[in-house]
Amino acid sequence: RTRSGSQLDGGLVLFSHRGTLDGGFRFRLSDGEHTSPGHFFRVTAQKQVLLSLKGSQTLTVCPGSVQPLSSQTLRASSSAGTDPQLLLYRVVRGPQLGRLFHAQQDSTGEALVNFTQAEVYAGNILYEHEMPPEPFWEAHDTLELQLSSPPARDVAATLAVAVSFEAACPQRPSHLWKNKGLWVPEGQRARITVAALDASNLLASVPSPQRSEHDVLFQVTQFPSRGQLLVSEEPLHAGQPHFLQSQLAAGQLVYAHGGGGTQQDGFHFRAHLQGPAGASVAGPQTSEAFAITVRDVNERPPQPQASVPLRLTRGSRAPISRAQLSVVDPDSAPGEIEYEVQRAPHNGFLSLVGGGLGPVTRFTQADVDSGRLAFVANGSSVAGIFQLSMSDGASPPLPMSLAVDILPSAIEVQLRAPLEVPQALGRSSLSQQQLRVVSDREEPEAAYRLIQGPQYGHLLVGGRPTSAFSQFQIDQGEVVFAFTNSSSSHDHFRVLALARGVNASAVVNVTVRALLHVWAGGPWPQGATLRLDPTVLDAGELANRTDSVPRFRLLEGPRHGRVVRVPRARTEPGGSQLVEQFTQQDLEDGRLGLEVGRPEGRAPGPAGDSLTLELWAQGVPPAVASLDFATEPYNAARPYSVALLSVPEAARTEAGKPESSTPTGEPGPMASSPEPAVAKGGFLSFLEANMFS
C-alpha cells in the first residue's frame, strides 16, 4: 500500500499495535523517479502504565498558618509501581490565597512549579495561607495540578484548600479575627477596641448586602475579678452581661481596673452571630477568654535597640549577640526580659546551648548576652525574619524582628548575551540578559560597581553617569549604556558584583547592532555575478535617521568570489573593479556586483559563504554586519531571487544561443523564485536526508 509524504507529515498514517511487543514493517521509498532499497522500521510496544490519584484532595488550613500536604491529601501511584521520586506534579495553577513552597528551599520569590510524590511523603511541600486585610470566616482556594510519570498519560488533579476559623487550630487558639488581650496601667481604664478583640470574621459569614443589619452578640460568662467592664459608661453585670461587636467597633467597651495590685485579670465570653434586631441566624459561635494584663504604673517600658541582621552560610550555626537583639530597660534585669517567637522563618531555627537540639520559642536577654542563643541554618538559601515579641513582664509586649541572611558560598555573574546597542540610537538599557547574579538561587538584591569603565561610552542611571548600580535598577531598565565616541563598533566594561557579602567580577561586552536590512534570499548561482542593490543590502533607514549617506567597508569575505564595481554602460571601457568600500548610493545606483565563486578542490555542489561589513554613518557608532548566503551550481531552469548581471561561461556555451545569455553589465530580469517543491521537515524529509545517497 502506498502512503505519501504529505500524509505522513499530516499525522494521517497511524500504527496500530497487535500481537508481540517487538516488531515493525518493511517499506520502500520512491519519489516517482528513483526507488530506494527496502528499509525496516522497528516498533517496540510498551505495556500501558496508568497513573491513579488517591487521597482526599482536600486540605484544611488554619488562617495564617502553614500546612504540609500529606499522603492523606495527595497520594499518587502507578500500575507499574513507580518510585515516588518519579511521580511528578506540575503546578498548573497555583493558589490564590497563599503560596505553595518547599520546606528546604522556601522560595520566597518564585512560586513552586513542580514537586514529587516523595516530597509530599516527606512533608516537604507546604501550603502557607496569607492573611488578607479583610476579615473572613471561611475561604476556599484551589490548586490545579498535573501528575505525570512517562510513559503514562498525564492525570489532572485539583486540590481544594479550605481555610476556616471553624477549625481547631493549635497555632491560633481563638476563632475570632482578633483576641489579643489588653494591657492596662494599674488603677486606670483602657478601651477595648477591635485592635484587641474583633469578631468581624463571624459577620463575614453573612453576605455583604445583609451584613449591616447583623451583629455579633458577646455574652460575658465570667466577669473580670479585679475590674469592671463598661459599655457606653454603663457597667456590665450578671443581669446585663451583653455587648455587641458594633459597640466594640464604636469604641464603647471599656475595662476599668479597680487598683490594688498588678495580678492578671480577664473575662470569659460566648460570641455568636445574630440577625437583624437580634433574630436568630445559623451563624458561627465561639466561647473564649480575653486576657487583661495589669502593669505597674511606675514601670518604664523596655526600649528595643536597632538590630543588625545575622549573616551566616547555609547549613552553619552562628551565635546571636546584642548586635541582633538588645533592649534598654533600666528597671529590669536581662533575665526578666523575655522574648517569644511569634513566627519563625523556614531557613533555620533558634537553639539554646544546653537546651537540647530542638528549636526554642522562648528565651531571655540573659541568654543572648551570655552567647547561649544561636541560630542553626538548614539547607535553605533564603533570607528570613523572626517575628518576636519582647516583654519585661510588666509592660505590653513589643513586636521585634530578627533578620537572618543566608550567605552564599560563592556567586556567579551570568552574562547571557552581549549588550546590543541599536546603531541609530547609540544607547541601550542593560537587562538580565547582560547582568544577573546567581548563587544557589537568583540574587535580586545584587549591587554592581564599575571597576573598569568603557572606552567609547558611559553608563548612565537617570541620565547621569554612574559607577554603581543595583540589580533592581537593571531589571527596571534604568541602567543605560550610551556611546559618547562614534569611532568603534564595540566596547566593554568590567563590573564587580556584590550579593549577600560575596563578590565576583565580570566583563560586559557591548556591540553595535547595524541598522541594516539584509535579504539573502534563496541560493545564489556559482560562477554568476549578481547585482548588490537595496533588495540585498539596505541602509536607507540609517540614511534617513542620520541625514547622511551610509558607508560600507568590506572587512572579510567572500571566501569564494569578490565584490566588484560594474561599468555603468556596455560602452564604458574596462571590466569590473574590485571594491573594498562603497556607499548606500552605490547600492541604489546598481553599481555593485557580487561575483559568486565556486569552492575549489571539491566536487560541485551547494556551499555557504558570507560577507562581513562595517557600516558607518554620521554621528553614530559604526556597526559590523554580515551577509550570509548559500550558493549552488548554476541551474538555468531555476528562477533566482536576485538580478543576475552575468551567468557562468559554461552555461552560456551549453545553451548555444547568444540571446539566452544576459550580457555582462546589463541587469537580468528580477525573478522571484518560489520555494522548491520539497516537503519541509517530517518523517519523509528525514528519510530523504538519511537514506538517499
Epitope: 457606653s232 454603663e234 464604636a250 455568636h272 445574630q274 437583624p276 437580634g278 436568630s280 459561635q285
Partner: antibody, heavy 117, light 113 residues
C-alpha cells in the same frame, strides 16, 4: 436610668393618620433597636415592627406593610411611628420598646389611640 | 410566621402555690449553632406596660425574683412561679424572638382563688 417617654393619648377619625413619638434617654440611642407593639383593649400583644436608630433601617410586620412608617431623629433621640388609613380596629395602646437583643427589656408607658367617628 | 399558643388561657391559684404556664411554638425556636432557645416571658399588670422576666427560655432578667424560672427547648416551654406572691397576679405572655415577625402568645391570666 433608661427611659422611654411616649406622646399623649389621641382620638382620630377613621381614614385619618396618627403619629406617636417615643423619646429615649439614659442610654446611647443609636445602640439599640426600637420596636412598636400594640395592645387592643382586653386583648394580647401584637408586634408591629422595628427601626434601627443607627442606620434608619426598618422591618414591618406584613399586616401593617404599606400603612406604617417608622422614622427617627438622632438629634433628639426620638423615634416616630405613623399609621395611616385608620380603622376602628386600630384602637389600641401603642408601646415603644427598646430591645437589647430581640427581647424587649424596656418599654414606654404606652399611648392610647382611639379611632372613632 | 411562628404561631405561639399558651395554655391555659387563665389560671386560678392560691398564694404560696407553685404555678406553671405552658407555651408552644408552631416551629422550633432553637438555634442549633449557638444552642439558644429564642423565647422570652413577660409579665403585664393592668394599666402598665409589659415587663421582661426571662429571655433565651431560661435566663432571668436582672432584678427578677428567683421564684420565676423558665425551661424547655425547641417548641415546648414552661414558665414556673415557685411560690405565688400577691404581686405576681398579672397576665403572662411568651414571645418568640427567633425570627420576624416577632410573635406573642395570647396570654395567660393569673387570678387568686
Amino acid at each position: 436610668q433608661v427611659q422611654l417617654v411616649q406622646s399623649g393619648a389621641e382620638v382620630k377619625r377613621p381614614g385619618a393618620s396618627m403619629k406617636v413619638s417615643c423619646k429615649a434617654s439614659g442610654y446611647t440611642f443609636t445602640n439599640y433597636y426600637i420596636h412598636w407593639v400594640r395592645q387592643a383593649p382586653g386583648q394580647g400583644l401584637e408586634w408591629m415592627g422595628w427601626i434601627n436608630p443607627n442606620s434608619g433601617a426598618t422591618n414591618y410586620a406584613q399586616k401593617f406593610q404599606g400603612r406604617v412608617t417608622m422614622t427617627r431623629d438622632t438629634s433628639t433621640s426620638t423615634v416616630y411611628m405613623e399609621l395611616s388609613s385608620l380603622r376602628s380596629e386600630d384602637t389600641a395602646v401603642y408601646y415603644c420598646a427598646k430591645s437589647w437583643v430581640s427581647w424587649f427589656a424596656s418599654w414606654g408607658q404606652g399611648t392610647l389611640v382611639t379611632v372613632s367617628s | 410566621d411562628i404561631v405561639m399558643t399558651q395554655s391555659p388561657d387563665s389560671l386560678t391559684v392560691s398564694l404560696g402555690e407553685r404555678t406553671t404556664i405552658n407555651c408552644k411554638s408552631s416551629q422550633s425556636v432553637l438555634n442549633s449553632k449557638n444552642n439558644r432557645n429564642y423565647l422570652a416571658w413577660y409579665q403585664q399588670k393592668p394599666g402598665q406596660p409589659p415587663k421582661l422576666l426571662i429571655y433565651w427560655a431560661s435566663t432571668r432578667e436582672s432584678g427578677v425574683p428567683d421564684r420565676f424560672s423558665g425551661s424547655g427547648s425547641g417548641t415546648d416551654f414552661t414558665l414556673t412561679i415557685d411560690s405565688l406572691q400577691p404581686e405576681d397576679i398579672a397576665t403572662y405572655y411568651c414571645q418568640q424572638h427567633y425570627s420576624t415577625p416577632f410573635t406573642f402568645g395570647q396570654g395567660t391570666r393569673l387570678e387568686i382563688k
